[in-house]
């Protein structure tokens, strides 16, 4: 797991509530699922479904769980040691250069092109020229010029928030 986690937020400032388990740091750090106390003497458990930590750390607060946006499905819930895993809904995808939202996949390829890749949660359909095999730039064609296809089935997460 990476230390600097995308989409991370600190959980609201908290003191250890009665339900939060405490243990002693090991070699000065706290295990996944915990954060360190301000005096460095205790490890305090994260709150299930609210916050988490993924690795040995000296975080003063656990990291706030990501909430999946509308247009996303939750592949796995947030635990004390792992952030929520969100994925674009079927028929939509998220590109690396615009990770903030899921975009609709194109329904087909322009005339003279053939589909070689399905819509996935992390990529649009892929079109290539029939003759040359070069990729299409991605502008949406007119409906009458398209070769229709059905969206691909989501296979793996496109947005790992943690």
């Amino acid at each position: 797991e990476s230390a600097l986690i995308t989409q991370q937020d600190l959980a609201p400032q908290q003191r250890a509530a009665p339900q939060q388990k405490r243990s002693s740091p090991s070699e000065g750090l706290c295990p996944p699922g915990h954060h360190i106390s301000e005096d460095g003497r205790d490890c305090i458990s994260c709150k299930y479904g609210q916050d988490y930590s993924t690795h040995w750390n000296d975080l003063l607060f656990c990291l706030r769980c990501t909430r999946c946006d509308s247009g996303e499905v939750e592949l796995s819930p947030c635990t004390t040691t792992r952030n929520t895993v969100c994925q674009c809904e079927e028929g939509t995808f998220r590109e690396e250069d615009s990770p903030e939202m899921c975009r609709k996949c194109r329904t087909g390829c322009p005339r003279g092109m053939v589909k070689v890749g399905d819509c996935t949660p992390w990529s649009d359909i892929e079109c290539v020229h029939k003759e040359s095999g070069t990729k299409h730039s991605g502008e949406v064609p007119a409906v009458e010029e398209t070769v229709t296809s059905s969206p691909g089935t989501p296979a793996s997460p496109c947005s790992l928030s943690g």
């Epitope: 400032q13 070699e27 460095g40 000296d58």
Partner: antibody, heavy 118, light 106 residues
């Protein structure tokens, strides 16, 4: 408290380098240690942290998988193994001690310069 | 990760002046903020931790304040040895630093 870094120098992109930090004046084996770097004319950036006994480590995205922090408590020495070096890794590298009951760095070394260039 | 925005990036002041440097965190970090002083070619030196606690041996003219997202370092009466670059750092979530404030002689 004294921390003295060594091992910096000029290395080509893709190359490797190992930095050392000799500690004295305190019980080295009792302290969490870190490396922090400062690119020329830039601010400070945390690079790696290791637990007092050396069992646990963690890193930021920028170096994860390329840098490895380790320590030899018998020799009072902290290390940073840097592989697959990039031009953007050019910086002065400082070793730093996490203080008692403050969860932040209280003492730093003088630093050693690493230059990554062809 | 949490960004620390420090201002100003530089300032000119005279001996005896009161100097204030501010730091703004991109999200709530409680009081987990430290301030460091760095002189050219030297190691950074801890001045303040927990936003307002002076480190051992730091003169009383240095003080820190703030909580949440807004923090201030104040030098009540600037001395010749105080001309340096000052950095804020949050240590609530990993470690991130401000870009520094260079205090120069006017």
């Amino acid at each position: 408290v004294q921390l003295v870094e060594s091992g910096g120098g000029l290395v080509q992109p893709g190359g490797s380098l190992r930095l050392s930090c000799a500690a004295s004046g305190f019980t080295f084996s009792s302290y969490v240690m870190s490396w922090v770097r400062q690119a020329p004319g830039k601010g400070l950036e945390w690079v790696a942290t290791i637990s007092s006994g050396g069992s646990y480590t963690y890193y930021p995205d920028s170096v994860k998988g390329r840098f490895t922090i380790s320590r030899d408590n018998a020799k009072n020495t902290l290390y940073l193994q840097m592989n697959s070096l990039r031009a953007e890794d050019t910086a002065v590298y400082y070793c730093a001690r996490r203080g008692d009951s403050m969860i932040t760095t209280d003492y730093w070394g003088q630093g050693t310069l690493v230059t990554v260039s062809s | 990760d949490i960004q620390m925005t420090q201002s100003p990036s530089s300032l000119s002041a005279s001996v005896g002046d009161r100097v204030t440097i501010t730091c703004k965190a991109s999200q709530d970090v409680g009081t987990a903020v430290a301030w460091y002083q760095q002189k050219p070619g030297k190691a950074p030196k801890l001045l303040i931790y927990w936003a307002s606690t002076r480190h051992t041996g730091v003169p009383s003219r240095f003080s820190g304040s703030g909580s949440g997202t807004d923090f201030t370092l104040t030098i009540s009466s600037l001395q010749p040895e105080d001309f340096a670059t000052y950095y804020c750092q949050q240590y609530s979530s990993y470690r991130t630093f401000g870009q520094g404030t260079k205090v120069e002689i006017k």
